[in-house]
């Protein structure tokens, strides 16, 4: 059974994951982002089901394409580069989903834009956090 300290750690990791996903989304949605139209042409795979931490496997598998799309921003001055954000998200995802069991991700038939994709995983984090508090 999960202890209160392990639940607290999971909650904190989910909150950090949520914050960085929201940060990426905010940067993309910035009305001054000239690359937004191009970014929206890229399609992402969505999970058929995302209700448990093991389903983060589906997010992990899409992190490389996400980084590639974020690289389109090509800002002269990054406080944080796309690879910094994706690297941190990857570390959190690996810790949250665990590596003991191998879960085969099932994807929905319909693909999604980067905005829809990020919103889906933001909702996932919020949903799991709500069950822990």
């Amino acid at each position: 059974a999960p202890t209160s300290s392990s639940t607290k750690k999971t909650q904190l990791q989910l909150e950090h994951l949520l914050l960085d996903l929201q940060m990426i989304l905010n940067g993309i949605n910035n009305y001054k982002n000239p690359k937004l139209t191009r970014m929206l042409t890229f399609k992402f795979y969505m999970p058929k089901k995302a209700t448990e931490l093991k389903h983060l496997q589906c997010l992990e598998e899409e992190l490389k394409p996400l980084e590639e799309v974020l690289n389109l921003a090509q800002s002269k001055n990054f406080h944080l580069r796309p690879r910094d954000l994706i690297s941190n998200i990857n570390v959190i995802v690996l810790e949250l989903k665990g590596s003991e069991t191998t879960f085969m991700c099932e994807y929905a038939d319909e693909t999604a834009t980067i905005v829809e994709f990020l919103n889906r995983w933001i909702t996932f984090c919020q949903s799991i956090i709500s069950t822990l508090t």
Epitope: H16, L19, D20, L21, M23, N26, L80, L85, N88
Partner: nanobody, 119 residues
């Protein structure tokens, strides 16, 4: 409007350590990047290190392995632990608060704190 108050600068010998702190107040959003930039005399301002509220970090190559950035989200405070300081680290260090991972005109900057590394 965001206010940034820096502290911890000073004079230190080569090989020594310093810890900078920067507290943000005002219109703070939970999703942000805080960090440190520096400007040496006659040079352009450059990134030292930055950290997101989610824990993503970025370091300048010149400080990797020597400097560590951390933050306390509850206190809206960012810290820069500087070890093995070198004379070339001498500069004015500016705290930065941004709402996005890339630089834009809505970023906020502190007044700066002087760090001098000299024997």
């Amino acid at each position: 409007e965001v206010q940034l108050v820096e502290s911890g600068g000073g004079l230190v010998q080569p090989g020594g350590s310093l810890r900078l702190s920067c507290a943000a107040s005002g219109s703070i959003f939970s999703i942000n990047v805080m960090g440190w930039y520096r400007q040496a005399p006659g040079k352009q301002r450059e990134l030292v290190a930055a950290i997101s509220s989610g824990g993503s970090t970025n370091y300048a190559d010149s400080v990797k392995g020597r400097f560590t950035i951390s933050r306390d989200n509850a206190k809206n405070t960012v810290y820069l632990q500087m070890n093995s300081l070198k004379p070339e680290d001498t500069a004015v260090y500016y705290c930065m608060y941004a709402s996005s991972w890339y630089e834009d005109e809505t970023d906020y900057w502190g007044q700066g704190t002087q760090v001098t590394v000299s024997s």
